[in-house]
């Protein structure tokens, strides 16, 4: 997934999904970019991963993220988001054994190495938005979404009545 040495890349074969309890219903590899077409990239720095939001040079390959889709038992309030009234949740893994996680105390999005079953902080409710975009709502903190702040990913509290279409929480998935 990463264009830097020492970081395992995803091949076409996806993760082994034999986890205890909850299991994904589908998986796919995709690159993640913002509403304004900036790329979400990942870099290994001082033995920890940093997440950046940046304009990519033309010849640079986009980082890929493994999206694992899960069915949530919570009812879907949005037409087209769910199936049979279920919401979809996703986990996002840019490299093997590392997942994006919500740090609600710090209002940050971090990459952590963790074992399965994954913690609730690694799950995000998937919302289909206009302009072929999606948004990611924290399972652990409804109303809080992954968003872009100062060229980094952050957790952003959204007022449902006002800003659900706010550009800084909209993302595009592309193969």
């Amino acid at each position: 997934a990463f264009g830097i040495s020492g970081v395992p890349k995803y091949t076409r074969a996806l993760h082994d999904s034999s986890i205890t309890g909850i299991s994904p219903i589908t998986e796919s590899l995709a690159s993640l970019s913002t509403y304004n077409d900036q790329s979400i990239t990942f870099a290994l720095e001082d033995e920890s991963y940093e997440i950046y939001v940046e304009d990519l040079k033309k010849d640079k390959k986009k980082d890929k993220v493994l999206l694992s889709y899960y069915e949530s038992q919570h009812p879907s309030s949005e037409s087209g988001d769910g199936v049979d009234g279920k919401m979809l949740m996703v986990t996002l893994s840019p490299t093997k054994d590392f997942w994006l996680q919500a740090n609600n105390k710090e209002h940050s999005v971090e990459l952590h190495k963790c074992e399965k079953p994954l913690p609730d902080q690694a799950f995000f409710v998937l919302h289909n938005r206009s302009f072929n975009c999606v948004s990611f709502e924290c399972k652990t903190d409804p109303g809080v979404f992954i968003g872009v702040k100062d060229n980094h990913l952050a957790l952003i509290k959204v007022d449902y009545s006002e800003n659900l279409g706010s550009e800084n929480i909209l993302f595009k998935l592309s193969e």
Partner: antibody, heavy 123, light 108 residues
């Protein structure tokens, strides 16, 4: 009621063209990837083509690549399959199918199927 | 292209018996595999998705298992309405997506 209705099938000569349509109702069409699947008489299922919810990504089986074109009009809730340079081996019932989950991508199972439309390629 | 091989081609069983259908992929498809039932003159019907998740309204006698390259559909006790053709289908990352050749479950 969630429904898919295919139209446009019929008898066509080898080398001819045909356009199939699939009218969708009862769901948010643009949220779902769609596929065409065919079944030759007495044979098994063959995936033909798929398109993402936005229409930005399209996929084809090797057997139809360069001859068939999948498209969609989200404002009309309609899926299309333009079939050119038709061959006898394209004779089949053509089904349109909707993915199970509204994730816009094509990587999903098919939950809703139309009743199918028969395409016969023969001179 | 990922090839799905279903076995056996035909399964002759009696109502009440257990049916075990196999689907093997030529390379890993993760859990991106589904199972369908088709009866003559009808469109296919989704039974199992994500290798092991039962679709809404499907009786619990149907179950799916496996990941990677080896998958199984099990019908714990065959009912008269279960006699049909069953197909597996992979929708992994690289199209073309493919179906298996089918397994016909017939009355013995």
């Amino acid at each position: 009621e969630v429904q898919l209705v295919e139209t446009g099938g019929g008898l066509i000569q080898p080398g001819g063209s045909l356009r199939l349509s699939c009218a969708a109702s009862g769901f948010t069409f643009s949220s779902y990837a769609m596929s065409w699947v065919r079944q030759a008489p007495g044979k098994g299922l063959e995936w033909v083509s798929a398109i993402s919810g936005s229409g930005g990504s399209t996929y084809y089986a090797d057997s139809v690549k360069g001859r068939f074109t999948i498209s969609r009009d989200n404002s009309k809730n309609t899926l299309y399959l333009q079939m050119n340079s038709l061959r006898a081996e394209d004779t089949a019932v053509y089904y349109c199918a909707r993915t199970l989950h509204g994730i816009r991508a094509a990587y999903d199972a098919f939950i809703i199927w139309g009743q199918g439309t028969l395409v016969t390629v023969s001179s | 292209e990922i090839v799905l091989t279903q076995s056996p081609g035909t399964l002759s069983l009696s109502p009440g018996e257990r049916a075990t259908l196999s689907c093997r992929a030529s390379q890993s498809v993760g859990i991106n595999l589904s199972w369908y039932q088709q009866k003559p003159g009808q469109a296919p019907r989704l039974l199992i998705y994500g290798a092991s998740h039962r679709a809404t309204g499907i009786p619990d006698r149907f179950s799916g298992s496996g990941s990677g390259t080896d998958f199984t559909l099990t019908i714990s006790r065959l009912e008269p309405e279960d006699f049909a053709v069953y197909y597996c289908h992979q929708y992994s990352q690289s199209p073309p997506f493919t179906f298996g050749g089918g397994t016909k479950v017939e009355i013995k």
